[in-house]
């Protein structure tokens, strides 16, 4: 058993049939020593007396919260929820699994730029009774510090008969050095609680593995005289890192016929400009990517040739 | 008193743009997470798009991804909705948000794509 929060315990149990389960023995947080009793939830019934209880937690009807009272006072409470580990392996039951990069996934995370600013999310079916708490750090055996802000729900989609739930996290690196090479990566570490069950859920990174770049901005079409050609031209995005010299981005240029079977035209470059023959009915659509080291590349911004 | 008062709504034709705004007061606006949410004539109430109270982060419903396009500016109080290549189906009454299930939201912008 180990102290979450204040009055709020995690008792680890192996969770398998007829596991003997934990031993807890709670204390009334009082300097009184007589006349105490102890209650669970709701309930009025009384299961034992005395400055401490001991119980024997093997399912989730032996958690919830312990509240010791004296007289009908009330004298102090503690919250009890399970964390189970069913054949060695902590459950995870709360989030779902993104299974994008890999199987396993339940927290992903992103960066606009290098600035130490990033956001994780996470996708859970379950609407009510949750709560969510973010901890980070660069490295850990001799951690530095990163603030988090509080889990937000960010969005809800329906995937068949179910809504999915995706929650955010925003997150800043106190130190960050958008420059300088990275040797210890980023640990987000999120405790989930539902009704009474506990879990965690970990993730480490580098930023430079997280970077995904806004939109290319302002994308232009200007059309060459006597020619089916247009020049098409486009910004850095407003919230990639600066100087453009040193954060440099490379940009992926394409043109779409109005059919998703149509052959794509596509032109890389450097440069914030490209030109290319504009179809009737097609779209141009631009994206970057890091120059130097191969991100994420971003979303498409796009215009119709018309 | 939280008040939140949408404009910007108006008939366009398919392929067109509208800006929506969203003047926010009674509350501390650069502490909030804000969303755009939708409801179409006979329609439950849609989410559409979320921005963190930094602004760093956005989200956006599959529909909508990659045509709109959600801002704010915290000095001014104001939330935005950029939407480019509008469609029929993004026809809906448009709110402002508080919370994503839109229990706290304004009177909402009427957005009408037709040609």
């Known amino acids: 058993i180990w102290e979450l929060k204040k009055d709020v315990y995690v008792v680890e149990l192996d969770w398998y049939p007829d596991a003997p389960g934990e031993m807890v023995v709670l204390t009334c947080d009082t300097p009184e020593e007589d006349g105490i009793t102890w209650t669970l939830d709701q309930s009025s019934e009384v299961l034992g007396s005395g400055k401490t209880l001991t119980i024997q937690v093997k399912e989730f009807g032996d958690a919830g919260q312990y509240t010791c009272h004296k007289g009908g006072e009330v004298l102090s409470h503690s919250l009890l929820l399970l964390h189970k580990k069913e054949d060695g392996i902590w459950s995870t039951d709360i989030l779902k699994d993104q299974k994008e990069p890999k199987n396993k996934t339940f927290l992903r995370c992103e960066a606009k730029n290098y600035s130490g600013r990033f956001t994780c999310w996470w996708l859970t079916t379950i609407s009510t009774d949750l709560t969510f708490s973010v901890k980070s750090s660069r490295g850990s055996s001799d951690p530095q510090g990163v603030t988090c802000g509080a889990a937000t729900l960010s969005a809800e989609r329906v995937r068949g008969d179910n809504k999915e739930y995706e929650y955010s996290v925003e997150c800043q690196e106190d130190s960050a050095c958008p420059a300088a090479e990275e040797s210890l990566p980023i640990e987000v570490m999120v405790d989930a609680v539902h009704k009474l069950k506990y879990e965690n859920y970990t993730s480490s990174f580098f930023i430079r593995d997280i970077i995904k770049p806004d939109p290319p901005k302002n994308l232009q079409l200007k059309p060459l005289k006597n020619s089916r050609q247009v020049e098409v031209s486009w910004e850095y995005p407003d919230t990639w890192s600066t100087p453009h010299s040193y954060f440099s981005l490379t940009f992926c240029v394409q043109v779409q016929g109005k059919s998703k079977r149509e052959k794509k035209d596509r032109v890389f470059t450097d440069k914030t400009s490209a030109t290319v023959i504009c179809r009737k009915n097609a779209s141009i659509s631009v994206r970057a990517q890091d120059r130097y080291y191969s991100s994420s590349w971003s979303e498409w911004a796009s215009v119709p040739c018309s | 008193e939280v008040q939140l008062v949408e404009s910007g709504g108006g008939l366009v034709q398919p392929g067109g743009s509208l800006r929506l705004s969203c003047a926010a007061s009674?509350?501390?606006?650069?502490?909030?997470?804000m969303y755009w949410v939708r409801q179409a004539p006979g329609k439950e109430l849609e989410w559409v798009s979320t921005?963190?109270?930094?602004?760093?982060?956005?989200r956006y419903a599959d529909s909508v991804k990659g045509r709109f396009t959600i801002s704010r500016d915290n000095a001014k109080n104001t939330l935005y909705l950029q939407m480019n290549s509008l469609k029929p189906e993004d026809t809906s009454l448009y709110y402002c948000?508080?919370?994503?299930?839109?229990?706290?939201r304004g009177q909402g912008t009427q957005v009408t794509v037709s040609s």
């Open positions: 948000a508080r919370d994503l299930g839109g229990a706290l």
């Open positions: 921005i963190s109270n930094s602004g760093f982060t956005t």
């Open positions: 009674g509350f501390t606006f650069s502490d909030s997470w």
